[in-house]
Each structure stands twice: as structure tokens, then as C-alpha cells.
């Protein structure tokens, strides 16, 4: 058993049929010595008396809020949560496996630049009685500070018969060094509590590996005289690290119709302009990627050819 | 060329060669990017590689103030990786595929380090740790880790030279 936060405790249980469970001793936080009784949740049934209560925790029925009283007055609470371990593996029932970039990916994180700011998100089908708390650090043995905000519900989607909820959190490294080569990864830890079930999820990454620039901005077209060609120009996204002579991007420019199967024109460039062939009913799209490190491409920025 | 006395390097040449190094480092093992090597316990292997750290003056302001600190750090790293790529980690079993770009990468690391420090001038170089894994699978894992780490190192070096070529070239 360990303390998650004040008056909230997590009991780690090996979860299998007829498992013996864990013996837990609760102590009432009071100077009083006698006349103390214990109850669980909303029930008035007295579970025991005395300053301490010893219970055998085997299942979710044994978890919940234990309260000690004296003469009708509440003295203190202890909330017990269960963390299940099945076949040596901690349960992952609360969050959905996003399977990208690999199986057992519950947390996904992205950064728009090298400032040390990043966003992580996760998915669940659970809609109520759900809380998350997020902690992060750079490195684990001698951790350096990363500050995370509160996790918020960022999107709701319908997937077949199920509703899916996306939660996200923003974090910022306290003393980020954008130009340095990271040697210790960022660690992100998410505590998830659904009713009386506790689970924790972790992710470890370098900012450089989760970089995904915003799309290029201000796409403009200039038709070239006596030619089918068009000069397309754009700018670095505002959110990208500066100076751009140091934090450089490379770009992919593509002209394509509405369908992926249609023919296309495509060119890669380090500049912020390119000449392409525009077709009726086609769009010109540009996306960006770090020039020197192969992290994710941005989403496309598009303008119609016409 | 960067010399210990402090004259400027051939920024544009260094820029071109460092960008080539980036391309080669990724083609040497593109799939490395998709392997989570941190799960394999890095500490004893790649913690010893020289990293370009916050105080090394490789940020835009540091380069403007005095690029020599940063160039020396990059030079140390280039020599370090050049020696690693020539060591039995890469030459031993399992043999590299003959079309692996590791050979080109090795030569380009040497080429850039020589651009930064012509013969006759000497900057301190970092001692290579004795990493000689006994098992072929350990060697394979170590190669991946070294290449992964090299990708990050040459990316920073390429940014330095691109910025230098754009803003510090005579």
C-alpha cells in the first residue's frame, strides 16, 4: 500500500481467482483513543472499533472510503483504491491502446518546436467518475523539472456504437535549452482513477522525436507568364523555433485533385517557394519537416489551384 | 577552417558536409527511428558519448559570441563517432550489409572533422569508452543506439553550420 495523495491510498493486488489479497491496517487520524468506530462509504454498518482497523483487501468491494467516527462526529477518512496486477502486468483498462506508433501506446505526445513545451493526449471510452493527474520530469535518476497543467477533455468522437473521449495536457520544461542535444529523455507519468480503480501510464521520449511542426502559413500563388506553371510561396509557421537560419525546415509541395488516386505533381525543397504545375480542380499543398532530423511531417496547408 | 587560435571555419563547406551527414545517418538505419531503444537500458552504452550541451555555446547567441567553444565540442564528437564507427562494434559480426551507408558515414565524419581541424592543430579529444560487446545481438543493439545518438548529434551540428553559413560567413 502507498499514499497517492493526502488520505488516498493505493493497494496493489495480484489479481487472480482466490487470491489472498493484502492485509491493510488503517489508522484514525485523531488524538482520541477510545469510542472510535469505522464505516465504509455510505453504509452505517460498523466494521470495527478502535483507533486502527485491519482489513483484508481482495476485491473492489473492499475498496472505498473508510471513515472513523466518535459519537456521530467524523474524525478522518482514508480512501482505498485498487491497482490490479494480472500475470505480472499492471492493468490498463482505463485508457485505450492507440497502437501508433506501436502497440501498447496509451499516451501520445507532440511538440510544435524545441522550446520544451509539449502536449500529450490519451483516449478512453469512460465518461464519468474519472480523474487524471500528470507529472513529468527530464530524466528519472536526477530529475529536472517539467511543469504540467491539468488534464482536460479535449475532444469527443463517436466510434461505431461507442463514444470515445480524448484528454490532453500541456507541459513545459522549466529550464529548456532548445539548441542542445538532449541526452536524457522526458518522462511523463499519468495517474488515472476510475471509481475505485487506479492505473498509471508512462511515456518516455526526447523532444526531437516528437516534433511535429505546424503547417506552413500564408500560402500564395503567382501564375507564371506563358506557362502552366505556378509559383507557390509560403512562410514558416509562427510556432516554429527561431532563428530559422538555425532551426531550419524542409518542405514537400504537392499538387493533387480531390482523390488520392489522381495524378499529382510533387517536389521537395528547402526554400519557401517552388514552381509547380496547377490543374483545374486540384489543390496545392505544402507541409514541413525539421530539415536535419527526421521527425514527423506537419499537416498539409492547402490552397485551391483556381 | 576552425583552428585553435580562433579563425573562422569554412562555414559553407561545413554546412554542406554536415547536411550530408544528416542524410547518411538516417539512411544508415532509418528503422532505428522506430525502435524504442531506451527500453533496453542505455546507461552503460550511450551515456558516454559526447553530447552538445547547453553550456557548449552551440546556440545562436553562443555562436555569435565565440564559435570556438562549440566548434571544439563538435570536433570532439566527430572524432568520437568516427572512432566508434571504425571499431569492432561496426566491423565485427554480424557483418554490415555491403550496401550500408555506414562506410560513407564514417568517411564523412572524418572529412568534417578535418575541415574543422587541419593537421598540425590539436584540440583535446575525448577518450573512447571500451565498449566491446561479446554477443552479436548486443553489438547490433549497440549499433542502433550509436546511430540513433549520432542522428541527434549531427542534427545539432548541421544547425550550427547552417546558421554559421547564413550569419557568420565573411
Amino acid at each position: 500500500i502507498w499514499e497517492l495523495k493526502k488520505d488516498v491510498y493505493v493497494v496493489e493486488l495480484d489479481w487472480y481467482p482466490d487470491a489472498p489479497g493484502e492485509m491493510v491496517v488503517l489508522t484514525c487520524d485523531t488524538p482520541e483513543e477510545d469510542g472510535i468506530t469505522w464505516t465504509l462509504d455510505q453504509s452505517s454498518e460498523v466494521l470495527g472499533s478502535g483507533k486502527t482497523l485491519t482489513i483484508q483487501v481482495k476485491e473492489f468491494g473492499d475498496a472505498g472510503q473508510y471513515t472513523c467516527h466518535k459519537g456521530g462526529e467524523v474524525l478522518s477518512h482514508s480512501l482505498l483504491l485498487l491497482h490490479k496486477k494480472e500475470d505480472g502486468i499492471w492493468s490498463t483498462d482505463i485508457l485505450k491502446d492507440q497502437k501508433e506508433p506501436k502497440n501498447k501506446t496509451f499516451l501520445r505526445c507532440e511538440a510544435k518546436n524545441y522550446s520544451g513545451r509539449f502536449t500529450c493526449w490519451w483516449l478512453t471510452t469512460i465518461s464519468t467518475d474519472l480523474t487524471f493527474s500528470v507529472k513529468s520530469s527530464r530524466g528519472s535518476s536526477d530529475p529536472q523539472g517539467v511543469t504540467c497543467g491539468a488534464a482536460t477533455l479535449s475532444a469527443e468522437r463517436v466510434r461505431g456504437d461507442n463514444k470515445e473521449y480524448e484528454y490532453s495536457v500541456e507541459c513545459q520544461e522549466d529550464s529548456a535549452c532548445p539548441a542542445a542535444e538532449e541526452s536524457l529523455p522526458i518522462e511523463v507519468m499519468v495517474d488515472a482513477v476510475h471509481k475505485l480503480k487506479y492505473e498509471n501510464y508512462t511515456s518516455s521520449f526526447f523532444i526531437r522525436d516528437i516534433i511535429k511542426p505546424d503547417p506552413p502559413k500564408n500560402l500564395q500563388l503567382k501564375p507564371l507568364k506563358n506557362s502552366r506553371q505556378v509559383e507557390v510561396s509560403w512562410e514558416y509557421p509562427d510556432t516554429w523555433s527561431t532563428p530559422h537560419s538555425y532551426f531550419s525546415l524542409t518542405f514537400c509541395v504537392q499538387v493533387q485533385g480531390k482523390s488520392k488516386r489522381e495524378k499529382k505533381d510533387r517536389v521537395f525543397t528547402d526554400k519557401t517557394s517552388a514552381t509547380v504545375i496547377c490543374r483545374k480542380n486540384a489543390s496545392i499543398s505544402v507541409r514541413a519537416q525539421d530539415r536535419y532530423y527526421s521527425s514527423s511531417w506537419s499537416e498539409w496547408a492547402s490552397v485551391p489551384c483556381s | 577552417r576552425a583552428v585553435p587560435g580562433g579563425s573562422s571555419p569554412a562555414w559553407t563547406q561545413c554546412q554542406q558536409l554536415s547536411q550530408k551527414l544528416c542524410t547518411l545517418a538516417w539512411s544508415a538505419h532509418p528503422l532505428v527511428g522506430h525502435m524504442d531503444l531506451r527500453e533496453e537500458g542505455d546507461e552503460e552504452t550511450t551515456n558516454d558519448v559526447p553530447h552538445i550541451q547547453c553550456g557548449d555555446g552551440c546556440d545562436p547567441q553562443g555562436l555569435r559570441d565565440n564559435s570556438q567553444f562549440c566548434l571544439q565540442r563538435i570536433h570532439q564528437g566527430l572524432i568520437f563517432y568516427e572512432k566508434l564507427l571504425g571499431s569492432d562494434i561496426f566491423t565485427g559480426e554480424p557483418s554490415l550489409l555491403p550496401d550500408s551507408p555506414v562506410g560513407q558515414l564514417h568517411a564523412s565524419l572524418l572529412g568534417l572533422s578535418q575541415l574543422l581541424q587541419p593537421e598540425g592543430h590539436h584540440w583535446e579529444t575525448q577518450q573512447i569508452p571500451s565498449l566491446s560487446p561479446s554477443q552479436p545481438w548486443q553489438r547490433l543493439l549497440l549499433r542502433f543506439k550509436i546511430l540513433r545518438s549520432l542522428q541527434a548529434f549531427v542534427a545539432v551540428a548541421a544547425r550550427v553550420f547552417a546558421h554559421g553559413a547564413a550569419t557568420l560567413s565573411p
Epitope: 489522381e262 521537395f268 525543397t269 | -
Partner: antibody
Framework: EVQLVQSGAEVKKPGATVKISCKAS????????LHWVRQRPEKGLEWMGW????????EYAPKFQGKVTITADTSTDTGYLELSSLRSEDTAVYYC???????????WGQGTLVTVSS | DIQMTQSPSSVSASVGDRVTITCRAS??????LHWYQQKPGKAPKLLIK???QSISGVPSRFSGSGSGTDFSLTINSLQPEDFATYYC?????????FGGGTKVEIK
Amino acid sequence: EVQLVQSGAEVKKPGATVKISCKASGYTFSDYYLHWVRQRPEKGLEWMGWIDPENGDTEYAPKFQGKVTITADTSTDTGYLELSSLRSEDTAVYYCAANKELRYFDVWGQGTLVTVSS
Amino acid sequence: DIQMTQSPSSVSASVGDRVTITCRASQSISINLHWYQQKPGKAPKLLIKFASQSISGVPSRFSGSGSGTDFSLTINSLQPEDFATYYCQQSNSFPLTFGGGTKVEIK
């Protein structure tokens, strides 16, 4: 299977005009760009121009502007290259090539040898 | 126009050898570079697109690398059917241009 089959060899006199064809099969003709590439005897490859069969748009290499006309007939899935004012230096193998991507060549015809001789 | 210079213009090699052909552009072309193989009397065949992207059906012994102005095509463990002429082609801007070719001959 995507295929381009070109018309047979031609022998022409200087000053004449020649029109060679390239018949596409195995794909929807208007879904691919069609290019023409020249290869003179013992020489390298030279890109001449392209056509978008869907709308008839064309673009020519400046070197071949005015010299060649590229057309396409979607009813027969055939592309054409017309060379005018032939000279001996136009003696070459002419290839048609196609791709969904405009700037490189995925599928090639077998080539048509045009000989210009008096 | 962008000039493409291939070297060497010819190379003699034996079956099993590793052969590297280089291609240099007269200006930076990012990764807009493609490689073709041509055998005598036949049409060219696409081997590599965008500097390093493999083409389905092309043996994995063919690999490409480079960006900017310098590119290379490597044939690992040359096979009898690989004796041919190889061309690079830039697609950075029109007109599309080819290198002069590199003939790989039997030693």
C-alpha cells in the same frame, strides 16, 4: 499490367514531318501524365515535354519548343509526338513514358527509332 | 537549366562487387533526384525515386542516398543482369534533365 506500345521505326527525309504514336493499356489513360524522351545514337536521355491527356495541357523543354507537338486522343488511349522540319540530328530513339507523378517516369514504351536521311 | 554530372562515365566491375555511381547537380535540388537503369536496345527502367526511396520490384541491392547537390547510387553485390547504363534525373525544376550516364561494364 500498365503498358505503353509505340509505333514502328520511321525513315524520313530532311525537312519532312513525322508523327509517332504511343498506345496505353492497363490503366485509365487520363490518370497518368505522358512524356516524350529522346535518345540520340550513343548519347544520353533528353526530356522533350509532357501532356496531361485529361485536359490536353502541355509543357515543352525550351530546346524542343516549336520543334515538337505532343497530343493525346483519349478515345483511343493514344499519345502522339509530331516532329517537324526534320534534320539529320533528329535521328534518335524516341520514348514515351508515363506516370501518375509528373516529374519522373515509371512506365516506358519500347522506343521508336526515327532516322532522318537524304 | 540544371546540369547533372555523373561520374564515372564508365566503370568496370566483376559479379559480386559493390559499385557506387555519383551524380552532382549544378545547384541544390533537395531530394528531387531519380535513378534509371538502361540495357542496350531497351527502354530505361526506374530504380530509385526521390534520392533514396525504393521502387517495388527493384532488388534491394540497389540503394540511393544524398540530398542537395551530391547523390549516389550503390549496387551491392553486382549481378550479371546489372551490367547496363545508369542515369540520374532531376525533378527539381523544368526542364527535367538527365545525367550523361554511367556504363557499368564487365571487368
